[in-house]
């Protein structure tokens, strides 16, 4: 998956950021999990949407809205529930 961060500049502890995790052309619909740098699940303020294309493959976008701490690592894990395959990506904000 790919990740984007907004705002992505001039950040301070206390800022609210939006982290978007995107994965494309999967089948079937994926499961998305978020966790912090210690592996603690992040379940609040998560919005996940999935959309099928003409081929019936799914694009997934999951948005985590989080208040930054002093240092933070945020990871998203995209799981194929049938194949039990995981793909993950993370961003560290210092």
């Amino acid at each position: 998956p790919s990740m984007t961060l907004e705002p992505n500049k001039d950040l301070r502890p206390g800022d609210t950021v939006t982290i978007t995790c995107s994965s494309y052309q999967g089948y079937p619909e994926a499961e998305v999990f978020w966790q912090d740098g210690q592996g603690v699940p992040l379940t609040g303020n998560v919005t996940t949407s999935q959309m099928a294309n003409e081929q019936g493959l799914f694009d997934v976008h999951s948005i985590l809205r989080v208040v930054l701490g002093a240092n933070g690592t945020y990871s998203c894990l995209v799981r194929n529930p049938v194949l039990q395959q995981d793909a993950h990506s993370s961003v560290t904000i210092t």
Partner: antibody, heavy 122, light 107 residues
Framework: QVQLKQSGIELVRPGASVKLSCKTS????????IYWVKQRSGQGLEWIGR????????YYNEKFKDKAILTADKSSSTAYMQLNSLKSEDSAVYFC???????????????WGQGTSVTVSS | NIVMTQSPESMSMSLGERVTLSCKAS??????VSWYQQKPEQSPKLLIY???NRYTGVPARFTGSGSATDFTLTISSVQAEDLADYHC?????????FGSGTKLEIK
């Protein structure tokens, strides 16, 4: 060229609210922070808060948390600050400013609006 | 909150003199300090960012220095158009804060 144009003079009654505007042009509105700063007559500058219009991320100086509400309208590239429950001590000039990347990884308030004078009086 | 203390409150200088303005932070702010010039009835203008970097178009007579808690703005040879208030501000941590300003008058 980057410009920030603020709304005109406001004369308001105690207890009322006022909404100030800051119309921007000449840069990508959603990609930089907008700051709001208060200056009472003959005084220094006081930071109220800032908003990142791209995702409506805001941070307020605790002192102004119950006083100011920052919003942004992407379609018109305009930032707004609403001031509530106005008192005489809210009489001041209010500036908006862009938090620009003046050099790679260096940020500062590089462009300022002309200021809006707010007078609270009965 | 980090307190930024500027001194002196005001000063009166003759044309061509060297001017030194001080700004002290109540705790370490690294080099996250900017200086702003505000002429009468105008909005502030950025002079110095990152404690020592002159902003585009700012005359070379303006120099910023310092780090951690002690910062200085120097005008090497003051000109008539330098009549203004000078504000230092930190953006190291929330809430961002400014000093109370130094008013520069010309004799």
């Amino acid at each position: 060229q980057v410009q920030l144009k603020q709304s005109g003079i406001e004369l308001v009654r105690p207890g009322a609210s006022v909404k100030l505007s800051c119309k921007t042009s000449g840069y990508i509105f959603t990609a930089d922070w907008i700051y709001w700063v208060k200056q009472r007559s003959g005084q220094g500058l006081e930071w109220i808060g800032r908003i990142y219009p791209g995702v409506d991320s805001t941070y307020y100086n605790e002192k102004f948390k119950d006083k100011a509400i920052l919003t942004a309208d992407k379609s018109s590239s305009t930032a707004y600050m609403q001031l509530n429950s106005l008192k005489s001590e809210d009489s001041a000039v209010y500036f908006c400013a862009r938090g620009g990347e003046v050099r790679r990884d260096f940020y500062a308030l590089d462009y300022w609006g002309q200021g809006t004078s707010v007078t609270v009086s009965s | 909150n980090i307190v930024m203390t500027q001194s002196p409150e005001s000063m009166s200088m003759s044309l061509g003199e060297r001017v030194t303005l001080s700004c002290k932070a109540s705790e370490n702010v690294g080099t996250y300090v900017s200086w702003y010039q505000q002429k009468p009835e105008q909005s502030p203008k950025l002079l110095i960012y990152g404690a020592s970097n002159r902003y585009t178009g700012v005359p070379a007579r303006f120099t910023g220095s310092g780090s951690a808690t002690d910062f200085t703005l120097t005008i090497s040879s003051v000109q008539a158009e330098d009549l203004a208030d000078y504000h230092c501000g930190q953006r190291y941590s929330y809430p961002f804060t400014f000093g109370s300003g130094t008013k520069l008058e010309i004799k």
